[in-house]
């Protein structure tokens, strides 16, 4: 009886694992084996595919074959018993194009209200992704074990921290990798669960902000308790993508070690141009808080976000405020590369009740004022894009008296 060729050959490639699956054409014939050949582009001869010769099952692994993953190859299969079937040719394919990203490895560390996630590719030193190792981004799904309500977090790197969690609570998550440059989305990792720790006695510092004053950076934060000492550390932001790098070490800011106030001042020349991450930790001598949420600090944006300058035209029942670009030393205006919004705070000189106005335009009317009354005004700039999340310090307050009645024209 003539043997029929096998059909429906599927090539599955996950990371560096090359798997072939196929269907028997004739289930009634026993003791059949199967063999594959391969052919590289531009070659006439077929070569036996090692790992896929005389196979009794309908699956084989040819991962040991050292292929150029960017080069197109062709496969063919036949069945063998006493005689052989005709060859069945599989559509040619390029391994890299066909490859899927496997599940990443995930390691978790718990804090009281945060989880630190260390992610690495599932296959170490992968040949398939050798040129793309630093281009991986990851996404994850996390849920409270008790509720199952899922939250997705996209576009994270190999070290990520999830904040604002509940203490002593079990959270579960799964992670998948993506190579956005190649439109590849990977397979989810197994589910990993971890329980957050008991609430720490000392909370981490909050609301960290950086501003510029003279030739210095001013770093401020909020803290719940008095009589604490704080330390501040920095890291190059790009190292988050590549935590295997031996440079992945948080470093102290010398002027911000063991400070006793909720701010520290350090010279601008501490940082070269670039994007950094900053974090703050509190200590009372006996106990230490966990690190604060990390804030992104871009020297380019920060340098530009100086407090606005403004002048005031006073009427009887309103002020017209004209906001101009801040001045550098040498009285040259700073060019702002980012769309800004302005926060204007004003108050009656004899009162501490403040009113706040937020405007996008640089000429602002402050209405509903009383005649012949001294009002004080200060202003600061914010980046309109909340992701940049940058604010200048407030300008110095300027105080002006409104005019007598009937001068509002």
């Amino acid at each position: 009886k003539n043997l029929k060729s096998p059909q429906k050959v599927e090539v599955d490639i996950i990371d560096d694992n090359f798997i072939l699956r196929w269907n028997r054409s004739d289930e009634s014939v026993g003791n059949v084996t199967f063999s594959f050949d391969y052919q590289k582009t531009g070659m006439d001869n077929w070569i036996k595919l090692s790992g896929c010769q005389n196979i009794t099952s309908t699956k084989c692994n040819f991962s040991s074959l050292k292929l150029n993953v960017y080069e197109e190859i062709k496969l063919r299969i036949r069945a063998e018993k006493e005689n052989t079937s005709s060859w069945y040719e599989v559509d040619s394919f390029t391994p890299f194009r066909k490859a899927q990203i496997g599940p990443p490895e995930v390691h978790l560390e718990a804090e009281d209200k945060a989880i630190v996630i260390h992610i690495s590719p599932g296959t170490k030193d992968s040949v398939m992704w050798a040129l793309d190792g630093l281009s991986f981004t990851y996404s994850l799904v996390i849920w409270k074990n008790s509720s199952g309500v899922e939250e997705r977090i996209e576009n994270i790197y190999s070290r990520h921290k999830i904040y604002k969690l509940s203490p002593e609570t079990t959270y579960c998550l799964k992670v998948k990798a993506a190579l956005l440059t190649s439109w590849k989305i990977g397979v989810y990792s197994p589910v990993h669960c971890i329980k957050t720790t008991v609430e720490n006695e000392l909370p981490p510092p909050e609301n960290i902000e950086v501003s510029v004053q003279n030739q210095n950076y001013v770093l401020k934060w909020d803290y719940t308790y008095a009589n604490m000492t704080f330390q501040v550390q920095w890291l190059h932001a790009f190292l988050k993508r590549n935590p295997g790098n031996h440079l992945y070490k948080w470093k102290q800011i010398p002027d911000c070690e063991n400070v006793k106030t909720t701010q520290c001042v350090f010279p601008q020349n501490v940082f070269q141009k670039g994007i950094y991450l900053l974090r703050v930790q509190a200590s009372d001598g006996n106990n230490t808080s966990f690190w604060s949420e990390e804030i992104k600090f871009d020297t380019e944006i920060q340098a530009f976000l100086l407090p606005p300058v403004f002048n005031i035209r006073s009427l009887s029942d309103s002020f017209h405020i004209y906001i101009g670009a801040p001045k550098q030393s040498g009285n040259t205006p700073v060019i702002q590369d980012y769309p800004l919004i302005y926060e204007i705070i004003f108050w009656e000189n004899t009162s501490n009740a403040e009113r706040k106005i937020i405007e996008k335009k640089t000429d602002v009317t402050v209405p509903n004022l009383k005649p012949l009354t001294v009002y004080c005004v200060k202003a600061r700039a914010h980046t309109m894009d909340e992701k940049l999340n940058k604010s200048s310090v407030f300008s110095d307050a300027v105080c002006e008296k409104t005019k007598p009645g009937n001068t509002s024209k």
Epitope: I341, I357, I358, P367
Partner: nanobody, 126 residues
Framework: QVQLQESGGGSVQAGGSLRLSCASS????????MGWFRQAPGKEREGVAA????????YYADSVKGRFTTSQDNAKNTVYLQMNSLKPEDTAMYYC???????????????????RGQGTQVTVSS
């Protein structure tokens, strides 16, 4: 002193509706920006809707467009948030917020800079 008082929160099944109200006092109501932001446990604040009380122009976050509508009643110094086709992911504490602004009345402005009320809880179950 600006005072904002929300009401109308509660529990509802997915697909249901709720109407939140916010009464303001101690605040120049006309020609200002009012509206809503929300915060779910363990999540960042999210701007929801804003209305310019001087002309009634409205602005919405993408996540609620077509489902939520904000409106005002000038006589009562009150703004409303009509929430239809509610989803479990709408579960959050909803805050009414107000900020003086003629040129930057957005949900983002309210979330970042607005004076806010005490909040009202909205829970949507599946």
């Amino acid at each position: 002193q600006v005072q904002l008082q929300e009401s109308g929160g509660g529990s509802v099944q997915a697909g249901g509706s709720l109407r939140l109200s916010c009464a303001s006092s101690g605040y120049t109501y006309s020609n200002n920006c009012m509206g809503w932001f929300r915060q779910a446990p363990g999540k960042e604040r999210e701007g929801v809707a804003a209305i310019y009380t001087g002309g009634g122009s409205t602005y919405y976050a993408d996540s609620v467009k077509g489902r939520f509508t904000t409106s005002q009643d000038n006589a009562k110094n009150t703004v409303y948030l009509q929430m239809n086709s509610l989803k479990p992911e709408d579960t959050a504490m909803y805050y009414c917020a107000a900020v003086e602004s003629r040129t930057y009345c957005t949900p983002d402005a309210l979330k970042r800079f607005g004076y806010r009320g005490q909040g009202t809880q909205v829970t949507v179950s599946s």
